[in-house]
């Protein structure tokens, strides 16, 4: 599932390159392992912002698929309460390219621990 999430992220990156979206997104670029679920939640919430701002059907479908995949992969620990983690709004705002790169890094963290 996580491998499919990465391919969806690459697809979103390709789709966005053909558009002009200037959004800045809350991005966790240095995820601590004990906060990875919280960070994933922030990434997914911000991904929905991309979908809404793009107004593009392919991006919308890919984001929805990515959320479904991530949800199922995290169904066992998605409700784990992590303490001492940053709120999404406390994270640094970065452009879409940097956001997607950081997103791939966190997904790789999940792949390495699964």
């Amino acid at each position: 599932n996580w491998v499919n999430v990465i391919s969806d992220l690459k697809k979103i990156e390709d789709l966005i390159q053909s558009m002009h979206i200037d959004a800045t997104l809350y991005t966790e670029s240095d995820v601590h392992p004990s906060c990875k679920v919280t960070a994933m939640k922030c990434f997914l919430l911000e991904l929905q912002v991309i979908s809404l701002e793009s107004g593009d059907a392919s991006i919308h479908d890919t984001v929805e698929n990515l959320i479904i995949l991530a949800n199922n992969s995290l169904s066992s620990n998605g409700n784990v309460t992590e303490s001492g983690c940053k709120e999404c709004e406390e994270l640094e705002e970065k452009n879409i390219k940097e956001f997607l790169q950081s997103f791939v890094h966190i997904v790789q963290m999940f792949i390495n621990t699964s």
Partner: antibody, heavy 122, light 112 residues
Framework: EVRLMESGGGLVKPGGSLKLSCAAS????????MSWVRQTPEKRLEWVAT????????YYPDSVKGRFTISRDNAKNTLYLQMSSLRSEDTALYYC???????????????WGQGTSVTVSS | DVLMTQTPLSLPVSLGDQASISCRSS???????????LEWYLQKPGQSPKLLIY???NRFSGVPDRFSGSGSGTDFTLKISRVEAEDLGLYYC?????????FGGGTKLEIK
């Protein structure tokens, strides 16, 4: 008023195939994900398949995965369910339903058709 | 898979009474983004199911305010404050937080 009209049901032998259709009207079909849901003779409901707005992504429960294929033709405003290797437990009334977007709405099935009956028996 | 357990199986009521239907999931159905995709559907005799409530407590357009949904995590409830004749039928809860999406077994609301 949103309209969904299923067709293609009938009597089929175990191991056989059938293709169901769902004609959509009175809404922009390509703006919505769609699902198939079936109701057994005992009145239990079972989710069968979901397809994304553009048709690139499909989802199934294990009970039908590899046997059923959901697809859509946005130009014809039509949803399909290709069923193969049919079993007696696939006997049910099959409904198509429109899905509200997870991102902009509640991810619910807000409108359903009247259903088409499938009987698998020798 | 998430198992959805509905109780009671049958609920005999008098018109004007309050009715309450319970739905319990085998695991939390709060998704990673914090949403709980729990719906309630009503199937009247001879009709297809109709959406009543989505995301636990949101009433679908045209649904009377005597219907209300509540709950969180694994425990959910549908309440009908004053049952009317048109409310009779089969009620189903449904989770679409996690694939495979699953329905409860149904509750038949009938006249006592």
């Amino acid at each position: 008023e949103v309209r969904l009209m299923e067709s293609g049901g009938g009597l089929v032998k175990p191991g056989g195939s059938l293709k169901l259709s769902c004609a959509a009207s009175e809404f922009t079909f390509s703006n919505y994900a769609m699902s198939w849901v079936r109701q057994t003779p005992e009145k239990r409901l079972e989710w069968v398949a979901t397809i994304s707005r553009g048709g690139d992504y499909t989802y199934y429960p294990d009970s039908v995965k590899g046997r059923f294929t959901i697809s859509r033709d946005n130009a014809k405003n039509t949803l399909y369910l290709q069923m193969s290797s049919l079993r007696s437990e696939d006997t049910a009334l099959y409904y198509c339903a429109r899905r509200v977007s997870m991102i902009t709405g509640g991810w619910a099935m807000d409108y359903w058709g009247q259903g088409t009956s499938v009987t698998v028996s020798s | 898979d998430v198992l959805m357990t509905q109780t009671p199986l049958s609920l005999p009521v008098s018109l004007g009474d309050q009715a309450s239907i319970s739905c319990r999931s085998s695991q939390s159905i709060v998704d990673i983004t914090g949403n709980t995709y729990l719906e309630w559907y009503l199937q009247k005799p001879g009709q297809s199911p109709k959406l009543l409530i989505y995301k636990v407590f949101n009433r679908f357009s045209g649904v009377p305010d005597r219907f209300s949904g509540s709950g969180s995590g694994t425990d959910f409830t549908l309440k009908i404050s004053r049952v009317e004749a048109e409310d009779l039928g089969l009620y189903y809860c449904f989770q679409d937080s996690f694939v495979p999406y699953t329905f409860g077994g149904g509750t038949k609301l009938e006249i006592k």
